[in-house]
């Protein structure tokens, strides 16, 4: 079968980093600078990806794969493959439309990206503040305050929240 | 790839409970917020339930005191445990996750009728 | 905790521009984001942020705002893009939600 499609088709002996130049009587050609084909058989090199401006080189374009961007230091990536950047802020602010903005009292955000979220309520799981929130940080909730009676063990405070969507997976 | 898938939805009558899933795969729950929606028919999105990843919960005074939301860590599914169900509550309901100032990605959806 | 208002019906004639508006107070410190749901279907972002679009999105949509609106514009509507349109916007309260009440888009 791979013989017949051959003849029918001289492209699909092309291989990645090449494509089929019907310039040159389908002539498997290397892919020009700048340029490459991740798959065999193409008709044309696509353009590598630039990484300019805001974005830097994570990964070099070849002649089989395309250059991957990261953002410079004070951005962080948005979409799919890093398509774009977003202004970094400091943990206890959020991002609006006029620049990062401190959180509001009662406001918390742990990371650099995201928004400024309300602590949580201890007293609505009859529970108890141990550790009052900041701008940073949420509040960590205790023993409710019936609970707590002489030599009672404190509770451990759970790690800080991760950022939505940018956490390890 | 980034997705969530529902399931769960049905008939059922007033007063009564259900519980709806939404599994994701491309993301760990636990690690993000996340939120259940609803949309009634022929009506827009109204906001249900939030977790955070603390496990923090909150929700729209509309379900509170009748609907929780959970989730289940080991098997990265979201949970929405509905009881006392009305008629009101008739509606599609969506997870999603909540990357702060939008939502993506959204489950498909899954139709919860509540009615004699 | 504030309100997004929406025109509830616009239509476009096939590859002509149409430009979808909401209006509220969060629009004066957040950005919108915007999604499309067709009949039968989930909501799928199509907007978010300043003016970012999702991969496999066209870039016949972007976005826009100005002071307490924010505009989704489709420059040469297709036939695929008749749907509702909802903005979206954090409220003050971060964990409260706010979206407006949809837009039917007709492409004639």
């Known amino acids: 079968f791979e013989r017949t499609r051959s003849l029918q088709d001289p492209c699909s002996n092309c291989p990645a980093g090449t494509f089929c130049d019907n310039n040159r009587n389908q002539i498997c050609s290397p892919c020009p600078p700048n340029s490459f084909s991740s798959a065999g058989g193409q008709r044309t090199c696509d353009i590598c990806r630039q990484c300019k401006g805001v974005f830097r080189t994570r990964k070099e374009c070849s002649s089989t794969s395309n250059a991957e961007c990261d953002c410079t230091p004070g951005f962080h990536c948005l979409g799919a493959g890093c398509s774009m950047c977003e202004q970094d802020c400091k943990q206890g602010q959020e991002l609006t439309k006029k620049g990062c903005k401190d959180c509001c009292f009662g406001t918390f955000n742990d990371q650099k990206r995201g928004i400024c979220r309300p602590w949580t309520n201890c007293s609505l799981d009859g529970k108890s503040v141990l550790v009052n929130g900041t701008k940073e940080r949420d509040v960590v909730c205790g023993p409710s305050p019936a609970d707590l009676s002489p030599g009672a063990s404190s509770v451990t405070p759970p790690a800080p929240a991760r950022e939505p969507g940018h956490s390890p997976q | 790839q980034v997705q969530l898938v529902q399931s769960g939805g049905g008939l059922i009558q007033p007063g009564g409970s259900l519980r709806l899933s939404c599994a994701a795969s491309?993301?760990?729950?636990?690690?993000?917020?996340m939120r259940w929606v609803r949309q009634a028919p022929g009506k827009g999105l109204e906001w249900v339930s939030l977790?955070?990843?603390?496990?923090?919960?909150y929700y729209a005074d509309s379900v509170k005191g009748r609907f929780t939301i959970s989730r289940d860590n080991s098997k990265n599914t979201l949970y929405l445990q509905m009881n006392s169900l009305r008629a009101e509550d008739t509606a599609v309901y969506y997870c999603a996750r909540d990357r702060g100032q939008w939502f993506d990605p959204w489950g498909q959806g899954t139709l919860v009728t509540v009615s004699s | 905790s504030s309100e997004l208002t929406q025109d509830p019906a616009v239509s476009v004639a096939l590859g002509q521009t149409v430009r979808i508006t909401c209006q509220g107070d969060s629009l004066r410190s957040y950005y919108a984001s915007w999604y499309q749901q067709k009949p039968g279907q989930a909501p799928v972002l199509v907007i978010y942020?300043?003016?970012n679009r999702p991969s496999g999105i066209p870039d016949r949509f972007s976005g826009s705002s100005s002071g307490n609106t924010a505009s989704l514009t489709i420059t040469g509507a297709q036939a695929e893009d008749e749907a509702d349109y909802y903005c979206?916007?954090?409220?003050?309260?971060?964990?409260?939600?706010?979206f407006g009440g949809g837009t039917k888009l007709t492409v004639l």
């Open positions: 491309g993301f760990t729950v636990s690690n993000n917020y």
């Open positions: 979206h916007s954090r409220d003050s309260n971060g964990n409260h939600v706010i």
């Open positions: 942020g300043k003016n």
């Open positions: 977790i955070y990843s603390t496990g923090t919960t």
